[in-house]
Interface confidence: low
């Protein structure tokens, strides 16, 4: 099916850049690695490049105003043509949950004192209003809290005296038209509107005032245009050249509204001053090799030596990496395949260790799962051995960083009947739903 | 991954004062050594000092007498004060940390902050 073809793909906010134009096939759009497509119903972006996992989202808003509570964020496996690891297919979301709170404390209620006095008329004739307060402090509401219903009420009072009305001028008229339309007549152009004393009129009895002020109001009319000229598009010119040199680009064809210029105001061509074709080179670009992640370090050995662990002898150790991804022509991978470094084997050592400070508190796991819960830990950590954290293996090469290699095994003092890890694992609260921010979006 | 993070580096006269700072954070259980290194131009890099979990210190003999290093275990952070700075001590200083958990160990080096006493 055609889809929407874009130039770029903006990782952090997950969306196509650039329309390039619709009508193509995601394997044409997918030529390029930089580009993007999506589908024509309003679905997701989708980058050209090989599948892998999208940036995190911001957190979720805690699931409750107050106390503690939870919130998740996302991520989506996103790209074109396989999947981001074995069995998790393009468009699979990945969650994680963590414990929030908003606000420590939940607003309480107050609760409202006796009604104060009523306050004197708000006028001096005819009817008006009065009022009367409470206070909100018996008792203060907490945390944020208020008091249910009005701080005031008022009701309506009469002082049994009959008011004057005085004259007010009503709303101005509409501005009356231009006598002319352009400049250069016979009668300089102007404009008239008018009011009214009815909003309202004065009294008789006792006697209004009348309103201040003209009833009329006249004035020059100013920016009128010389007549107008419509303007008019020219030819198309040629067609540009394709501006790539593989996968898919774009044309421009150009016109000028000159036939004639738009001239004292007049409106000008409508339409557009361009418009553009998709051209396909229907070569495939260039994609450069990329390192994929070193492997693991190997054992750590000294020539000639069966075994150097637990032994103040440095060794070696080597890790590889692999330049995966280079296809048609795209440069290969700067820098060295290989790793060397110096070591100490500590593997299997039996060490002195120590108890670590408890960890803080990790993600709630499993996040969509039931019953999600956080933990921390304890670790009985080795104590490292004292060997010179340098060495000078060849004359003349200088002093070479030397890394501890290897699991050891540390031995603490037991606590709460461990020897190794001691974990404490905790409930999290109000875990909202995982659902599906596309989907949320409908 | 953990971050290793430098500051404090900066321009002294000959005799003057300076603090240099740095931090170990991210997923991190406890740094059991942390150490201060320099290299100046066209040198190997050397160790200047080092402090182990439990406040054990080693000095290079270019630096004793003029250069304390301390720690905060708790906060993951060492600080080298260094006093009577002579014009040698310019160099690229880096803080150096080693982690060890129950996975393995492992060694961490920040990017290094520029020291230069001029006379």
């Known amino acids: 099916d055609p889809v929407l073809c874009f130039t770029q793909y903006e990782e952090s906010s997950g969306k196509c850049k650039g329309l390039l134009g619709g009508g193509v096939s995601v394997k044409d759009c997918c030529l390029n690695t930089a580009y993007a497509y999506q589908e024509r119903n309003g679905g997701l972006c989708q980058p050209c490049r090989s599948p892998r996992w999208s940036l995190w989202s911001t957190w979720a808003p805690c699931s409750v105003t107050c106390s503690e509570g939870s919130q998740l964020r996302y991520r989506r496996c996103v790209g074109w043509n396989g999947q981001c690891s074995e069995r998790v297919a393009l468009g699979t979301l990945e969650w994680q949950l963590q414990a929030c709170e908003d606000k420590q404390c939940c607003p309480e209620m107050g609760g409202w004192s006796d009604w104060g006095p009523w306050e004197p008329c708000s006028v001096t004739c005819s009817k008006g209003m009065r009022t009367r307060r409470r206070a909100c402090d018996h008792p203060a509401p907490k945390c944020g809290g208020h008091c249910p219903g009005e701080a005031q009420e008022s009701e309506a009072c009469d002082t049994q005296q009959v008011c004057p009305t005085h004259g007010a001028w009503a709303a101005w008229g509409p501005w009356s038209p231009c006598s002319g339309s352009c400049h250069g007549g016979p009668h300089e152009p102007k404009e008239t509107r008018s009011r009214t004393c009815s909003a309202p009129e004065p009294s008789q009895k006792p006697p209004g005032k009348p309103c201040p002020g003209p009833a009329y109001e006249h004035r020059k009319c100013t920016g009128l245009p010389p007549c107008p000229v419509a303007g008019g598009w020219g030819p198309w010119g040629p067609v540009s050249p394709c501006p790539v040199t593989c996968g898919l680009g774009q044309t421009i064809e150009r016109r000028t509204c000159n036939r004639p210029v738009p001239q004292h105001g007049g409106p000008s061509c409508a339409g557009d001053a361009t418009r553009t074709h998709i051209c396909n080179t229907a070569v495939p670009c260039p994609v450069d090799g990329e390192w994929d992640l070193w492997g693991q370090w190997s054992t750590c050995v000294r020539r000639n030596m069966k075994s150097i662990s637990c032994e103040e002898i440095p060794g070696q150790q080597s890790r590889w990496r692999t330049c995966k991804g280079r296809k048609f022509d795209g440069h290969r991978c700067t820098g060295q395949q290989q790793d060397i470094r110096h070591c100490y084997s500590i593997q299997h050592c039996p060490l002195k260790g120590s108890w670590s400070e408890w960890s803080t508190w990790g993600l709630c796991m499993p996040p969509c799962g039931p019953n999600p819960t956080r933990a921390r830990q304890r670790l009985c950590t080795p104590l490292l051995p004292k060997y010179p954290p340098t060495v000078s293996m060849v004359e003349g090469q200088g002093e070479k960083n030397v890394t501890f290699w290897g699991r050891p095994l540390p031995r603490c003092e037991e606590l709460q009947g461990q020897k190794l890890v001691v974990e404490e694992k905790r409930p999290c609260l109000h875990v909202p739903a995982c659902k599906d921010p596309e989907e949320e979006k409908l | 991954q953990v971050q290793v993070v430098e500051s404090g580096g900066g321009l002294r006269q000959t005799g003057g004062s300076l603090r240099l700072s740095c931090t170990a954070s991210?997923?991190?259980?406890?740094?059991?050594?942390m150490a201060w290194y320099r290299q100046a131009p066209g040198k190997q890099r050397e160790l200047v000092a080092e402090?182990?979990?439990?406040?054990?210190?080693v000095y290079a003999d270019s630096v004793k007498g003029r250069f304390t290093i301390s720690r905060d275990s708790a906060k993951n952070t060492v600080t080298l004060q260094m006093n009577s700075l002579k014009s040698e001590d310019t160099a690229v200083y880096y803080c150096?940390?080693?982690?060890?958990?129950?996975?393995?160990?492992?060694?961490?080096w920040g990017q290094g902050t520029q020291v230069t006493v001029s006379s």
């Open positions: 150096n940390a080693l982690q060890y958990d129950r996975y393995g160990g492992a060694e961490y």
């Open positions: 402090i182990s979990r439990v406040g054990t210190t």
């Open positions: 991210g997923r991190i259980f406890e740094v059991n050594m």
